[in-house]
């Protein structure tokens, strides 16, 4: 069944730094960002197969959250539905749309600078850390009396893509979600066969940076299908 | 604030079964992986297992691989570890925490595995 | 599985001083995946640090992490009483994840 391949188990036994999933067909890829392992998804959606299954709201597009179809229907089947929009009902902040959040069971906007997500219990405060940024501008060393949040640094655990800081992604990783580095160029992607079929990946991929696309690397179009290495490139 | 309560603790003779229980309040439970971490008495941290924030992805350390098993209930904010075949060296304070790093924890439940 | 190795075993210092607590992996573990704990006796673990430099949240400035690749610090800039305790760190990069065995700081 879906969920017996779903509950994968311990990483191990691949290239270090990581192992691959026990028993589990989606690719393990490195959090680091030169370091990244291929790996097919053999679960992977067929372009015309609609709605997308699922399990996991990171499974799905950045505009959908994982649930079932029918008011209090079977838990065991879930597809990807639309994102909520602002002033509808919800119960998770990735029911709501981009740009929102859940509050109160309801989304709300998150562009007022009043946003913090749960992800406030565990705000970044980095120091002795070139890269460190606030909001994308360079941290000064003595900040105002105001209290800055400033958005999650690599590594730091994420709700969505907005709580990390610029350069950075909310991918999946084992059981948590956490802020990786937007990939660069010649770094291997995982091409989707549709948008969001994030499938079974143990880990995630960030998506490739701006001006780059997800494409076949060129010495592997003679390669069969299931092996074929993509790689970010220039547009 | 974020609080993690675990129970379900005790003595239990080997080969026995204990199922422990964490309540969490505080935070949007089902937006969250949680953690399993145990401490043998005078000794370190020891991860024992995780599970994302639906329930769909389980993951365990190889010692207890097979014997132990990690679930949670969104709806009522709980998070359990079934153990089975308790052997004398899982005689530990199991703790709960959220998070592949854990940034809150649970006070601790002491399991005792002893004939 | 990475092995994470802490030195030292014990840190005799005194309130006030500097205390510099390492931590060592058996792989580079190429990005900062790696957290550091404070135990104190007959408690659960407190999260200091995450993603090797940042600070959670209500820990004090004295509380700084550092480090890349293989070498992790845990650096305290002036010890006050209630640091004397145990420290791990913990790499979550993959699986297990794994902690340190522990430094323990006391009071010399």
């Known amino acids: 069944t879906l969920n017996s391949v779903l509950n994968s188990n311990a990483i191990k036994n691949l290239p270090p730094p990581l192992g691959g999933a026990a028993g589990h067909p989606g690719s393990a890829v490195s959090a680091a960002p030169g370091i990244l392992y291929p790996g097919g998804n053999k679960y992977q959606t067929i372009d015309n197969y609609q709605p997308y299954p699922c399990a996991e709201d990171e499974e799905c597009g950045t505009d959908e959250y994982c649930a079932s179809p029918t008011r209090g229907g079977d838990a065991g089947v879930q597809i990807c539905l639309a994102c909520r929009k602002r002033r509808k009902r919800c119960m998770r902040h990735a029911m709501c749309c981009p740009g929102n959040y859940c509050k109160n069971g309801i989304c709300v906007s998150s562009d007022q600078n009043n946003f913090r997500g749960e992800i406030e219990e565990t705000i970044t405060e980095s120091f002795g850390n070139d890269h460190s940024t606030l909001d994308g501008y360079s941290r000064r060393t003595t900040l105002s009396s105001k209290m800055y949040h400033s958005k999650g640094q690599e590594g730091s655990v994420c709700l969505r893509s907005s709580d990390c800081a610029t350069g950075l992604c909310c991918a999946r990783h084992f059981w948590s979600k956490i802020c990786k580095p937007v990939l660069k160029e010649g770094q291997v992607c995982t091409k989707h066969r549709r948008k969001g079929s994030h499938g079974l990946e143990i880990f995630q991929r960030c998506y490739c940076g701006e001006g780059l696309s997800c494409r076949i690397q060129k010495d592997h179009h003679q390669a069969s299908n299931s092996s074929r290495l993509h790689t970010c490139q220039r547009h | 604030q974020v609080q993690l309560v675990e129970s379900g603790g005790g003595l239990v003779q080997p080969g026995g079964s204990l199922r422990l229980s964490c309540a969490a309040s505080?935070?949007?439970?089902?937006?969250?992986?949680m953690t399993w971490v145990r401490q043998a008495p005078g000794k370190g941290l020891e991860w024992v297992s995780g599970i994302s924030g639906s329930g769909s992805y389980t993951y365990y350390a190889d010692s207890v691989k097979g014997r132990f098993t990690i679930s949670r209930d969104n709806s009522k904010n709980t998070l359990y570890l079934q153990m089975n075949s308790l052997r004398a060296e899982d005689t530990a304070v199991y703790y709960c925490?959220?998070?592949?790093?854990?940034?809150?924890w649970g006070q601790g439940t002491l399991v005792t595995v002893s004939s | 599985d990475i092995v994470l190795t802490q030195s030292p075993a014990t840190l005799s210092l005194s309130p006030g001083e500097r205390a510099t607590l390492s931590c060592r992996a058996s792989q580079n573990l190429f990005s900062p995946y790696l957290a550091w704990y404070q135990q104190k006796p007959g408690q659960a673990p407190r999260l200091l640090i995450y993603g090797a430099s940042n600070r959670a949240t209500g820990v004090p400035a004295r509380f700084s992490g550092s480090g890349s690749g293989t070498d992790f610090t845990l650096t305290i800039s002036s010890l006050e009483p209630e640091d004397f305790a145990v420290y791990y760190c913990q790499q979550y990069l993959s699986l297990p994840t794994t902690f340190g065995q522990g430094t323990k700081v006391e009071i010399k």
């Open positions: 925490a959220r998070t592949i790093y854990m940034d809150y």
């Open positions: 505080g935070f949007t439970f089902n937006n969250y992986g």
